[in-house]
């Protein structure tokens, strides 16, 4: 069951597998969450101990009963992970600790003008787990005003000191805020040369990608497949780190691939979920339990549902044996990956899926586009929302597009007018306008939020955040879409949909049935030329076909321009402005999402 | 087809920089099946790889030169480009920009099957 | 740095002649290993890759052999567009590395 209260003044007896120190419970509850074993912790908080080194340590337990026995200690504080739990799980901390020095090794030191440049400069360095930043306060007078960059081979610090005067945090890279380069490709027929800090067994390159991205100090990998000519090296996925950031060289061999950690882009793709399965192979580990079920699918359901297991192999069964119930070995190891992978068994094995709560939700696959036609179907595009107004009477006013449980992104241009957000309702997973009666259940809205430097749509900013009265809960009809990541700045999306219930053309009316329309990206150059009495701005997106026939248009405001990539879909633009509705030569323009991020990001975790 | 097509000055003066430009036209910058390749050769002299980039920004660079070279991408206008620093009258060569392919769909196809015509750069006052 | 080494530096043959280049690696380059062929003024030209690969478009009278550190390039019957310099490369190991190209002349 899922536990999320911490247990103040209580030591869990025993279970102990791991110390690292950590400068709050609630710190230590993620780490123990993000830990392949961890099921329970303590904390040790400054008043329960004389012993200043043991300050701040945060013990990591397991229990094959999923409990501990409880013991009273003054200023201990205990918890359970997050593993038990359903809800989103993120490693993002942006707490700042006052008067705390988090321990690493200090590999950087420069001036800075406050704690926050100091963070952001972590978090824009590749190496950097955490940082302390000497305050203008400190006695001594040549490290005021100093931003140490730190790392470890663990990512939490070796230790933690009570210091006046200095602040201390964590790498915003989790929080998706890093300006790093993101560089998806895996490299085929290549190793990378340089110090391995770590190795695990892996299925293939992309689970290899996967553990690299959520190892603190894995910058890049190589793996070797099964093809791989050293039996010895099979499967082996080498987690590796440089002194740049970046391989030093490349050697080419055949049957290796490498690449990059997704760090600086993991807030949309999937990271820690493993959801493939792995035909004619057996996973190999500590087995935690033997259940007879009916196909693979049931046995990955078996090991989600078991917080303990960490995944499994599928012995299917033996002709119509045992009423076509098969064999799920559930299984766990001290790093969570298979301590041996061997093919050619004629097992099924995979991952537990509980870890794809730790991913953003909008990285789950949607059911195929269908190719053809103008009108939508159900659940094609889940993050696409009607906005309406009540008053004077109750009608459709723009699209917007799902990005978190409680938050909306549309266009500010939306609101002129709008008083008050008690007049707006926002429907969730509609195809049809028709669908929506006196008795169909919306969303109210409790904050509208719009940029302070919206004036126009054509000047730019036109953008908005809607925070709702209360919380989406994700379905296959209704989930949200990933903001493009900072780091995919040089990614060009080839496959780009506009989709609303706007006109068709300008004079004309609101459509019942959700449309869409694949438009081709338009550089902002080009896009220029075709606007010359306005100024395209980095901030603002066009797309739209040279002889015009597509676009969006009006009522189509503030929905979305989704473009898939990597098989996942990302919110590009908001459908802002144009000349007319899809004509010669003016293409439709948005606002550029991806300049909005942190924008984005600091109103809806602020 | 693709076409790779140098630009830049061909004269440069002792310590400047030199700046060098490829434009890639008839395809794509923006494939991982590629890397894009700078080489150089010196009058009457064999070819000197200088460095290569992945459209990702991933480069790797001669270590002869590494601490003077940097090779960019810039996957909108769809051209990389070549700046080499403090340069010397032993700079002077013809600059060849390439595609180096690194094809993903396995073990097939690779080396520099696409060149520019080259562009010669002299280094003087 | 993998150092390449082209033999002979240059060859003399006539039109119709069986001419053999060989290129030595320094260290094992398994077969990444690629030839071009360059006239005056030109840029090179890919002629073979993997070592053994023939680039599309390229003739059939070029071969190539080899693999670990000992590489061959065959014209099987030289012809009049033949005529040029021919460069060896490893691309196994970055720096990628050429070697000293072997000019072949008119007898």
């Known amino acids: 069951e899922c536990v999320t209260r911490l247990f103040k003044d209580i030591h869990f007896e025993g279970g102990d597998i791991a110390t690292v120190f950590t400068p709050s419970a609630k710190h230590c509850q993620v780490v123990c969450t993000h830990h392949p074993r961890c099921l329970l912790f303590t904390f040790t908080g400054e008043s329960a101990s004389e012993d200043p080194t043991q300050w701040f340590t945060c013990v990591l337990k397991d229990s094959v009963t999923e409990t501990l026995p409880r013991v009273n200690r003054t200023g201990a504080i205990s918890g359970y992970s997050f593993k038990q739990c359903s809800h989103q799980i993120s490693a993002c901390n942006k707490d700042i600790y006052v008067d705390l020095d988090m321990k690493g090794i200090n590999y950087n030191s420069s001036l800075a003008k406050s704690a926050q440049e100091c963070q952001e400069r972590c978090t824009d360095d590749i190496h950097c787990h955490f940082f302390t930043y000497a305050t203008r306060q400190f006695p001594s007078l040549e490290h005021r005003n100093i931003c140490l960059l730190k790392h470890t081979q663990t990512g939490t610090p070796t230790g933690i000191m009570k210091l006046d005067k200095v602040v201390t945090g964590f790498s915003l890279k989790s929080c998706a805020l890093s300006n790093l380069a993101c560089i998806r490709d895996v490299f085929p027929n290549t190793v990378f040369a340089d110090s391995n800090i770590d190795s695990v067994m892996a299925p293939d390159a992309f689970v290899c990608r996967r553990i690299c991205t959520h190892h603190p100090g894995c910058l890049f990998f190589t793996f070797f497949s099964q093809e791989w000519p050293k039996e010895s090296q099979r499967n082996l996925c080498l987690l590796k780190t440089s002194e740049s950031g970046l391989p030093s060289t490349r050697i080419k061999k055949s049957k290796a691939l490498s690449g990059f950690s997704l760090q600086s882009c993991r807030h949309s793709i999937p990271v820690f979920c493993h959801s493939s399965f792995y035909h004619d192979t057996d996973f190999l580990g500590e087995e935690l339990d033997i259940v007879a079920v009916k196909g693979h699918e049931a046995c990955q359901k078996l090991c989600t549902n078991a917080v303990r297991c960490q995944f499994f192999t599928y012995a299917p069964a033996q002709a119509s044996c045992n009423e076509g119930k098969g064999k799920c070995y559930l299984k766990l190891s001290s790093n969570g990956s298979p301590t041996k992978i061997l093919r050619g068994t004629g097992g099924i094995s995979g991952y537990t899926l509980r870890l794809c709560k730790m991913d953003n939700e909008c990285t789950t696959k949607i059911k195929p586009r269908i190719v053809g036609g103008t009108a939508s179907v159900r659940g094609e595009w889940p993050w696409q929302v009607t906005l309406h107004t009540t008053s004077p009477t109750q009608r459709h006013l723009c699209g917007g597009s799902i990005i978190g449980n409680q938050w909306i992104l549309t266009a500010a241009h939306c609101f002129y007018g709008v008083e008050s957000p008690k007049i707006l309702r926002v429907y969730i997973g509609i195809l049809n306008q028709s669908e929506i009666k006196e008795d169909t259940s919306f969303f109210g809205v409790q904050e509208i939020i719009i940029h302070d430097q919206y004036k126009m749509a054509e000047s730019g900013y036109d953008i908005a955040l809607l925070k709702l009265e209360t919380t989406v809960n994700y379905t296959d009809s209704q989930r949200p879409i990933c903001l493009p990541s900072k780091g995919d700045r040089n990614v060009i999306y080839t496959d780009c949909w506009v989709t609303g219930w706007g006109y068709r053309k300008l004079r004309d009316k609101i459509q019942n049935t959700l449309q869409k329309a694949k438009i081709p990206l338009v550089t902002n150059d080009e896009c220029q030329k075709r606007y010359r009495g306005h100024k395209i701005t980095h901030k603002m997106i066009c797309a739209g076909y040279r002889e015009g026939g597509k676009d969006a248009c009006k009522g189509d405001s503030g929905g979305p321009l989704s473009c898939k990539h990597n098989e996942v879909w990302h919110l590009v633009g908001i459908t802002s402005w144009g000349e007319g509705c899809a004509q010669r030569e003016r293409p439709g323009v948005y606002t550029n999402v991806l300049e909005y991020v942190d924008w984005i990001l600091e109103k809806t975790q602020a | 087809q693709v076409q790779l097509q140098e630009s830049g000055p061909g004269l440069v003066k002792p310590s400047q920089t030199l700046s060098l430009t490829c434009t890639v036209s008839?395809?794509?910058?923006?494939?991982?099946?590629?890397?894009w390749s700078w080489i150089r050769q010196h009058p009457g002299k064999g070819l000197e790889w200088i460095g290569s980039?992945?459209?990702?920004?991933?480069?790797y660079y001669n270590p002869s030169l590494k601490s003077r070279v940097t090779i960019s991408v810039d996957t909108s206008k769809n051209q990389f480009s070549l700046k080499l620093s403090s340069v010397t009258a032993a700079d002077t060569a013809v600059y060849y920009c390439?595609?180096?392919?690194?094809?993903?769909?396995?073990?097939?196809?690779?080396?520099?099957?696409?060149w520019g015509q080259g562009t010669t750069v002299t280094v003087s006052s | 740095d993998i150092q390449m080494t082209q033999s002979p530096s240059s060859v003399s043959a006539s039109v119709g002649d069986r001419v053999t280049i060989t290129c030595r690696a320094s260290q094992g380059i398994d077969s990444w290993l690629a030839w071009y062929q360059q006239k005056p003024g030109k840029a090179p030209k890919l002629l073979i890759y993997a070592a053994s690969s023939l680039q599309s478009g390229v003739p059939s009278r070029f071969s190539g052999s080899g693999s670990g550190t000992d590489f061959t390039l065959t014209i099987s019957s030289l012809q009049p567009e033949d005529f040029a310099t021919y460069y060896c490369q490893q691309y196994h190991i970055v720096p990628i590395t050429f070697g000293g190209g072997t000019k072949v002349e008119i007898k």
């Open positions: 008839g395809g794509s910058i923006y494939s991982g099946a590629y890397y």
């Open positions: 390439a595609r180096d392919v690194d094809d993903s769909s396995g073990d097939e196809h690779y080396g520099m099957d696409v």
């Open positions: 980039i992945h459209y990702s920004g991933l480069t």
